[in-house]
Interface confidence: low
């Protein structure tokens, strides 16, 4: 099957890192500098992504794979393939249109990115607050008084607060 396919389509012989050059009788030509082809049989090479400004190069472009970018310190990636860089905030803050703002009382953010999320409401399930929440940390729910038999305790608090997304830094 491969042999037949090759006879019908000479371009199928061109490996990744090359392109099928119609101007040169469909021979396989290497991708020019700053371009790549990640699969065989391609008729053009794609231009390498440039990691500029707030983006920095995480992986250099090669003839067979595109460059990969991440963000300079103080910023984190957003979107597929790090299509955007967003400013970091401190723990206990969230990014708004007006910049980094402290979490409101009753909310927290334990990451440099993402939004402030509500503290877990321990009382909804009859649990007590073992450790109070802060802007940076969720509350820790402890057992209800009925759970406090020797050597036993509950670890199940109610109403989970979101785990903020993980910054690549």
């Amino acid at each position: 099957f491969e042999r037949t396919r090759s006879l019908q389509d000479p371009c199928s012989n061109c490996p990744a890192g090359t392109f099928c050059d119609n101007n040169r009788n469909q021979i396989c030509s290497p991708c020019p500098p700053n371009s790549f082809s990640s699969a065989g049989g391609q008729r053009t090479c794609d231009i390498c992504r440039q990691c500029k400004g707030v983006f920095r190069t995480r992986k250099e472009c090669s003839s067979t794979s595109n460059a990969e970018c991440d963000c300079t310190p103080g910023f984190h990636c957003l979107g597929a393939g790090c299509s955007m860089c967003e400013q970091d905030c401190k723990q206990g803050q969230e990014l708004t249109k007006k910049g980094c703002k402290d979490c409101c009382f009753g909310t927290f953010n334990d990451q440099k990115r993402g939004i402030c999320r509500p503290w877990t409401n321990c009382s909804l399930d009859g649990k007590s607050v073992l450790v109070n929440g802060t802007k940076e940390r969720d509350v820790v729910c402890g057992p209800s008084p009925a759970d406090l038999s020797p050597g036993a305790s509950s670890v199940t608090p109610p109403a989970p607060a979101r785990e903020p997304g993980h910054s690549p830094q």
Epitope: C141, T156, P160, A161, H166
Partner: antibody
């Protein structure tokens, strides 16, 4: 009682993908995070990522971010972990484990799924 | 990522001995530290959460302490059924990370 039941052992070729399932019962599936933790033979535990089934919000360990996809099906109370571009060092037992909120512990674990990557 | 370092990596003690395992975090994790027990060929089980809180059904001979970067798991009187590998895990920051484990054997 709370149970996390995982799919059976898999043998895979290098470069292929594997998808492991974790069926939850005995609690409200949408209220807890499902985490995936792996353990290579004779090695320690390594957290891969998690999902909040209520809205399919995910967090990934950057080490696996390009190769792992975690999904959840609320209708069947089942979470899935798919690992692609397998290599021999991905041979491990893969566990799903439940947690309730960010800093709380993994209180219930699945029985583990052995994935062997061999040519 | 926060690195979790356990010591010793293995130990051998007699039944009835007091056994101490330490776990050190590469940065301050407050009290967000959990301990798990994994018996040979078995699934990890939660022992202690939030540094010192015993999980349901865990014998009172197990205890935990510490804060910040240094934590301890203590078995006050080692029993044959305590033969296992013990792991610490931080719940402070993503990604969740585990210590390398401490294997406990009976002399």
């Amino acid at each position: 009682q709370v149970q996390l039941v995982q799919s059976g052992a898999e043998v895979k070729k290098p470069g292929s993908s594997v998808k492991v399932s974790c069926k939850a019962s005995g609690y409200t599936f949408t209220s807890y995070w499902i985490n995936w933790v792996r353990q290579a033979p004779g090695q320690g535990l390594e957290w891969m990522g998690n999902i909040y089934p209520s809205d399919s919000y995910t967090n990934y360990n950057q080490k696996f971010k390009d190769r792992v996809t975690i999904t959840a099906d609320k209708s069947t109370s089942t979470a899935y972990m798919e690992l692609s571009s397998l290599r021999s060092e991905d041979t491990a037992v893969y566990y799903c484990a439940r947690l309730y909120y960010g800093s709380s512990p993994f209180d219930y674990w699945g029985q583990g799924t052995t994935v062997t990557v061999s040519s | 990522d926060i690195q979790m370092t356990q010591s010793p990596s293995s130990l051998s003690a007699s039944v009835g001995d007091r056994v101490t395992i330490t776990c050190r975090a590469s940065q301050d994790i407050s009290n967000y530290l959990n301990w798990y027990q994994q018996k040979p060929g078995k699934v990890p089980k939660l022992l202690i959460y939030h540094t010192s809180r015993l999980h349901s059904g865990v014998p009172s001979r197990f205890s935990g302490s510490g804060s910040g970067t240094d934590f301890t798991l203590t078995i006050s009187s080692l029993q044959p059924e305590d033969v296992a590998t013990y792991y610490c895990q931080q719940g402070h920051t993503l990604p969740r990370t585990f210590g390398g484990g401490t294997k406990v054997e009976i002399k």
